[in-house]
Amino acid sequence: LPAQVAFTPYAPEPGGTCRLREYYDQTAQMCCSKCPPGQHAKVFCTKTSDTVCDSCEDSTYTQLWNWVPECLSCGSRCSSDQVETQACTREQNRICTCRPGWYCALSKQEGCRLCAQLRKCRPGFGVARPGTETSDVVCKPCAPGTFSNTTSSTDICRPHQICHVVAIPGNASMDAVCTSTSPTRSMAPGAVHLPQPVSTRSQHTQPTPAPSTAPGTSFLLPVGPSPPAEGSTGD
């Protein structure tokens, strides 16, 4: 004969455990039902009655099967330097991520605690490693034969045009100026494509990626000629 199916609440076998989506209530000393995501325990179980669940209120949530007396509060609204990538619902917390052109400088369990503006490489410097959601741009000085004349978080060093007759030679921050009408682009090795990312904490000398100045923060940061910018997000 098949074993009898136990309905909650029930006393577990000595040394036994409760089943999936059940928990052991110390007071009742019974296996009782957990509440599903989006709900919480309104009334705990007794020896004779099972857990009573209720829906989470607005701006609160539970993500897992649980027996918590109150749902968790959703995080505060996303700050101006962030976008909401996951809304607050009864089953999930709000998730804020940094908006385009920014990266997460300090993460928290879900989302980002501090967003900062991606570094802009100044003229003479190009992007050696692009920014990501969690890392800043790395700039490098443009090597001989290449240039960047922009202040940009995306522009790499580009090769100088090759002139039949050079009017003004190019340098790290300026393209060559030709007197002829049909200049061509040099294909200096590595000048057109970004280098492969270097291994983390690597040691290298130029013209590999070099560091940059602080992120663009206009409020928080004191003095400094041109400090980084960052924005802080609510926890």
């Epitope: 800043d136 700039c139 560091p211 602080a214 980084p228």
Partner: antibody
Framework: EVQLVESGGGLVQPGGSLRLSCAAS????????LSWVRQAPGKGLEWVAY????????YYSDTVKGRFTISRDNAKNSLYLQMNSLRAEDTAVYYC??????????????WGQGTLVTVSS | DIQMTQSPSSLSASVGDRVTITCRTS??????LPWYQQKPGKSPKLLVY???KLAEGVPSRFSGSGSGTDYTLTISSLQPEDFATYYC?????????FGQGTKVEIK
């Protein structure tokens, strides 16, 4: 107010090791690149090492490459310099400095008060 | 490595004098050059960045000029608190070297 406070200096024998720390406050630490600069007694300034804001890129002067390691802990607002195989010529005051925001703002804008490292037998 | 030649290594001047310190680099550094002031027993302080821009809180008697390989720090009217050692530095390719310093002393 931006503050950089170095610690960990002291007397060490040639071939020994020392770890310098720098506690930072008054700015959004995790968004700034940081460096170590040293100054031998009665001498000029020498840049030693650099680390970018995320700790991904590091650069070293040729004189310390392979012996010193720069690192940071953004959760603790701390910068470190692990110094191994120390030599007499490493004797100097070591400054923790903010910057450069390399490629964008190329300067050291804040300096700590320095910590003295003496390598001698 | 880029060589930094700073001159003079020392100079004597009087309060009110115009003082000029020069820094020459072995190759173009595209104005990626700050100047620092250091007083005895103290940490260096940023005076000028990007060769010509005055750092916040620095008196207007200090000015920077130059481009390419030749740079100058000028103190238009030397004040008693300006007696110190001055350093230039480049931020082009690593290593980021400093000039050897110019000590400005009281005549």
């Amino acid at each position: 107010e931006v503050q950089l406070v170095e610690s960990g200096g002291g007397l060490v024998q040639p071939g020994g090791s020392l770890r310098l720390s720098c506690a930072a406050s008054g700015f959004a630490f995790s968004t700034y690149d940081l460096s170590w600069v040293r100054q031998a007694p009665g001498k000029g300034l020498e840049w030693v090492a650099y680390i970018n804001n995320g700790g991904i890129s590091t650069y070293y002067s040729d004189t310390v490459k392979g012996r010193f390691t720069i690192s940071r802990d953004n959760a603790k607002n701390s910068l470190y310099l692990q110094m191994n195989s120390l030599r007499a010529e490493d004797t100097a005051v070591y400054y923790c400095v903010r910057g450069p925001f390399y490629g964008s703002a190329n300067y050291f804008d804040y300096w700590g008060q320095g910590t003295l490292v003496t390598v001698s037998s | 490595d880029i060589q930094m030649t700073q001159s003079p290594s020392s100079l004597s001047a009087s309060v009110g004098d115009r003082v000029t310190i020069t820094c020459r680099t072995s190759e173009s550094i595209y104005s990626n050059l700050p100047w620092y002031q250091q007083k005895p027993g103290k940490s260096p302080k940023l005076l000028v960045y990007d060769a010509t821009k005055l750092a916040e809180g620095v008196p207007s008697r200090f000015s920077g000029s130059g481009s390419g390989t030749d740079y100058t720090l000028t103190i238009s009217s030397l004040q008693p608190e300006d007696f110190a050692t001055y350093y230039c530095q480049h931020f082009w390719v690593t290593p980021w070297t400093f000039g050897q310093g110019t000590k400005v002393e009281i005549k």
